[in-house]
């Protein structure tokens, strides 16, 4: 009669944690008698899985009845896998006796486990950046295993290419995890826009998970100011408005100054939205110009979004008062200037 | 192809410690004894230990008290911690890879670094 | 400890001609699988050890055919079929059926 021989049929088995993973093993022959073990590894640090003989081993179960007379199937089934179990798994006969003795050993199979990467967070930069500058964004994603894997950038649906990824550790472990840091560089249109982070991995099958950043968080779009002079409303009275464009965020408030003197501060509050998320705001101040014996320079100050205020100033003539309502000849706007009040 | 590479200072002082490392480079970690060996001037090969992957650790008897093998898989690399050292331990340590195919011993030391020379001296 | 004993512990050799070294173990290498864990390794000058034979007969990957590892249980026995020029250095054998892996003392191969 041949010798006994331990069949393990398959040299590497995947398996998605959490799931249950079956180890096969066959022996040729019910001679010599004695029972199967299973080790995880070889040598002697080798782990014991399973016992057939004795021993308590909750996650184990055997796929056949392996006490019957004549079975030869001894394949197990492990419950419950995690990435720690991955390692190559023999399947070992031994000779009974006192105490029973290694007789033959499976080729063994390696045992290999697919965990899904958690879900990318996206995170950008802890300060807002104004249109033209360069901002990094970062991407993780852990605890997937095996190590491959695959991550992309896009911004409103187009790919970027200037980012980094790193996939820790370098060497061999349980799971993985995945950093990645994209440049983006705004525009004065990036209020509305998204950066998605994309990560590909065996275990998502072919559908990539996704992080999102709304830019609205990132980018903060500086107003630009423009202060005009409205046809007169009244004898001696002039409107002056201060047109505030494409801000955002909406944070901001408005400072008159007659003469470099605070006449009023208000904060934008009925704002109106453009179509790229950007808002416009209006203040306007009616002058007294009888109230004045000099020219007046009228400044519209704006501080937006906690930044060192901007401004913009129209003079005010006031050496010949208007004549009749509607009239212009009186406050001719001559010239506008803008300078950073700190 | 795997490569070993031993990395540690020269020179130890009497009574300190004797620290090394061996990077893995081109391989995996898993399945295999991770051991260093050493080899005094003009003698033969003496075994100090070494570790498995599961983190299990083997000792040579006479240098156990001594000694300590720790791996770090996140970083590919095992190290050797060898405390109060004297003359005696002046040698070339190699680290190298034990294979284990099946069964309760081993396949071979198919793998050894190029070796790295300490010297015990004042 | 397993104690390994080699002879003879110096073999001058002729380049051509068939060289042999001798190994004995204070105990049986054969497993109850039997599996003989006995090794063989050369060390040339000024570099590091390298892997023959393992399992007592079975050649490492990119070692010489002229190489063959021989005998079972406590007594074994390396046999080079042509030394080449190439072939000299100490060889060492070694156990690894227990902790700890013990070497013999080593057999230095030069030419005559």
């Known amino acids: 009669e041949e010798e006994l021989q331990v069949i393990q049929p398959d040299k590497s088995v995947s398996v998605a944690a959490g799931e249950s993973a079956i180890l096969h093993c066959t022996v040729t022959s019910l001679i010599p008698v004695g029972p199967i073990q299973w080790f995880r590894g070889a040598g002697p640090a080798r782990e014991l899985i399973y016992n057939q003989k004795e021993g308590h081993f909750p996650r184990v179960t055997t796929v056949s009845e392996s006490t019957k007379r004549n079975n030869m199937d001894f394949s197990i089934s492990i419950s419950n896998i995690t990435p720690a179990d991955a390692g190559t798994y023999y399947c070992v006969k031994f000779r009974k006796g006192s105490p029973d003795t290694e007789f033959k050993s499976g080729a063994g199979t390696e045992l290999s486990v697919r965990a899904k990467p958690s879900a990318p967070v996206v995170s950008g930069p802890a300060a807002r950046a104004t249109p033209q500058h360069t901002v990094s964004f970062t991407c993780e994603s852990h605890g997937f295993s095996p190590r491959d894997i695959t991550l992309k950038w896009f911004k409103n649906g187009n790919e970027l290419s200037d980012f980094q990824t790193n996939v820790d550790p370098v060497g061999e472990s349980v799971s993985y995890s995945i950093h990645s840091t994209a440049k983006v560089v705004l525009t004065r249109e990036d209020v509305h826009s998204q950066v998605i982070c994309e990560v590909a991995h065996v275990t998502l099958q072919g559908d990539p998970l996704r992080g999102t950043a709304n830019l609205s968080e990132t980018i903060r779009v500086p107003p630009t100011l423009e202060v005009t002079q409205q046809p007169v409303r009244a004898e001696n009275q002039v409107n002056v408005t201060c047109q505030v464009r494409k801000f955002y965020p909406q944070r901001l408030q408005l400072t008159w100054l007659e003469n470099g003197n605070v006449s009023r501060t208000e904060t934008a509050s009925t704002v109106t939205e453009n179509k790229d998320g950007t808002y416009n705001w209006m203040s306007w101040l009616l002058v007294n110009v009888s109230a004045h014996r000099d020219d007046v320079k009228l400044t519209c100050q704006v501080e937006h979004d906690g930044q060192p205020a901007v401004s913009k100033s129209h003079d005010l003539k006031v050496s010949a008062h208007p004549k009749e309502q509607g009239s212009n000849t009186a406050a001719e706007n001559t010239g506008s200037n803008e300078r950073n009040i700190y | 192809q795997v490569q070993l590479q031993e990395s540690g200072p020269g020179l130890v002082k009497p009574s300190e410690t004797l620290s090394l490392t061996c990077t893995v480079s081109?391989?995996?970690?898993?399945?295999?004894?991770w051991s260093w060996i050493r080899q005094p001037p003009g003698k033969g090969l003496e075994w100090i230990g070494f570790i498995y992957y599961n983190g299990r650790t083997f000792y040579q008897s006479s240098l156990k008290s001594r000694v300590t093998i720790s791996l770090d898989t996140s970083k590919n690399q095992f190290s050797l911690k060898m405390t109060s050292v004297t003359a005696a331990d002046t040698a070339v340590y190699y680290c190298?890879?034990?294979?284990?195919?099946?069964?309760?011993?081993?396949?071979?030391?198919?793998?050894w670094g190029q070796g790295t020379t300490v010297t015990v001296s004042s | 400890d397993i104690v390994m004993t080699q002879s003879p512990l110096s073999l001058p050799v002729t380049p051509g001609e068939p060289a042999s070294i001798s190994c004995r173990s204070s105990q049986s290498l054969l497993y109850s699988t039997g599996y003989t864990y006995l090794d063989w390794y050369l060390q040339r000058p000024g570099q590091s050890p390298q892997l023959l034979i393992y399992?007592?007969?079975s050649r490492a990957s990119g070692v010489p055919d002229r190489f063959s590892g021989s005998g079972s249980g406590t007594d074994f026995t390396l046999k080079i079929s042509r030394v080449e020029a190439e072939d000299v250095g100490v060889f060492y054998c070694g156990q690894a059926l227990q902790t700890p892996l013990t070497f013999g003392q080593g057999t230095k191969v030069e030419i005559k």
């Open positions: 190298a890879r034990v294979r284990a195919y099946s069964g309760i011993g081993l396949d071979g030391t198919d793998v």
């Open positions: 399992g007592g007969s």
């Open positions: 081109g391989g995996s970690i898993r399945d295999y004894y």
